[in-house]
């Protein structure tokens, strides 16, 4: 590229610093916070995105019943430790030496402990249930149109292989999107369902991670689909380990 083309950006991650100093003048981008190089042709891992976010200046039944082992991210934001591939480290600790184990989407799956806490492996989240409520519309969306549109969205915007979108359920005004991806199914280069779900969640909240002018503009047969509530449930390959005290609180 010529010097005139010195403005390069990362379409899939606005929380980056980029410059055309890669091989052949190709655009190279590094994530804020970690300084790790990211591949801008695909999604950035949730761990690196959370790290970048924490470093930024502060400012009837077709519906699925979440399993008893389903986790919801109640702890919110924290500054995570990521491994060299950008994945969450199994054990996370805060500045006061309080530690806990997380799953592959960074959600706590054990009680909090001290520095002696052991997290032997990063447990994979293999099933994600995204539960949405859309704003009132003149009539219900056509289920097959909605299904096709959401599958298209996850393929084209979030780069998620269609086989990982297991199902789309709809009972007006509730929409549920099921993502499934076992360790054995995920090939090199495949987007992780946890990363796709995180990008979708940020899009729905109007906090798009994508570069560009606007956020997500989702339409079904030309009719805008506006979401007013989102809940995400995470199911791990191994059930979480919480004490009975937490379960009865």
């Amino acid at each position: 590229h010529t010097a005139a083309q010195d403005n390069c950006t990362c379409p899939t991650n606005k929380m980056t610093v980029c410059s055309p100093d890669g091989p052949g003048g190709r655009c190279q981008c590094r994530a804020l916070g970690s300084g790790m190089a990211v591949d801008c042709s695909t999604l950035t891992s949730k761990c690196l995105l959370l790290k970048a976010r924490m470093s930024a200046p502060k400012n009837a039944r077709t519906l699925v019943r979440p399993s008893e082992h389903a986790l919801v991210d109640n702890d919110g934001l924290y500054d995570p430790d990521c491994d060299p591939e950008g994945r969450f480290k199994a054990r996370q600790c805060n500045q006061t030496s309080v530690c806990w184990c997380v799953n592959s989407v960074g959600v706590r799956r054990t009680d909090k402990g001290d520095l002696s806490l052991r997290c032997d492996e990063l447990v994979r989240t293999h099933h994600i249930l995204i539960d949405l409520r859309h704003r009132p519309t003149a009539g219900a969306f056509n289920h097959s149109d909605l299904d096709a549109e959401l599958r298209r969205l996850f393929r084209e915007r979030y780069r998620l292989h269609p086989k990982f979108v297991a199902a789309v359920h709809y009972e007006q005004p509730t929409i549920q999107i099921e993502l499934r991806q076992n360790t054995s199914q995920k090939a090199a280069g495949d987007v992780d369902i946890g990363d796709a779900a995180y990008y979708f969640e940020r899009d729905i909240k109007g906090e798009s991670l994508f570069q560009g002018r606007g956020g997500l503009d989702l339409r079904v047969r030309g009719e805008p689909l506006q979401v007013e509530r989102t809940l995400i449930y995470y199911l791990d390959e191994i059930p979480p380990k919480f004490s009975m005290k937490r379960l009865t609180a």
Partner: nanobody
């Protein structure tokens, strides 16, 4: 500021060919999928074709399949649309635009593009 500049439009007879070019200035197209969108007189903008950031995936609207070919040269920061066997209904303003969508299996809709050129007029008439 992202600037996309189209060229290559003009007046051509039915059955003829044109090659449109889309060049980016002060901006590298690396990682962006690029598409061509056209607007016929009195009609809404319609996605014609797109090419993925790597160039490995291309998609076309049914109305132009087999006649139009999209390609890109990332070293030259340029995308091309080769239009053959042109018909009067291909007349319109052709825009090039960049999108964060992948172009892996679909042509993005007009509202899914982020950065637009000013357009170049294509007229197919005898």
């Amino acid at each position: 500021q992202v600037q996309l500049v189209e060229s290559g439009g003009g007046l051509v007879q039915p059955g003829g060919s044109l090659r449109l070019s889309c060049a980016a200035s002060r901006f590298t197209l690396d990682y962006y999928a690029i598409g061509w969108i056209r607007q016929a007189p009195g009609k809404e903008r319609e996605g014609v074709s797109c090419i993925s950031s790597s160039g490995g995936s291309t998609n076309y609207a049914d109305s132009v399949k087999g006649r139009f070919t999209i390609s890109r040269d990332n070293a030259k920061n340029t995308v091309y649309l080769q239009m053959n066997s042109l018909k009067p209904e291909d007349t319109g303003v052709y825009y090039c635009a960049a999108t964060t969508y992948a172009c892996s299996g679909y042509v993005p809709r007009a509202y899914e593009y982020d950065y637009w050129g000013q357009g170049t007029q294509v007229t197919v008439s005898s």
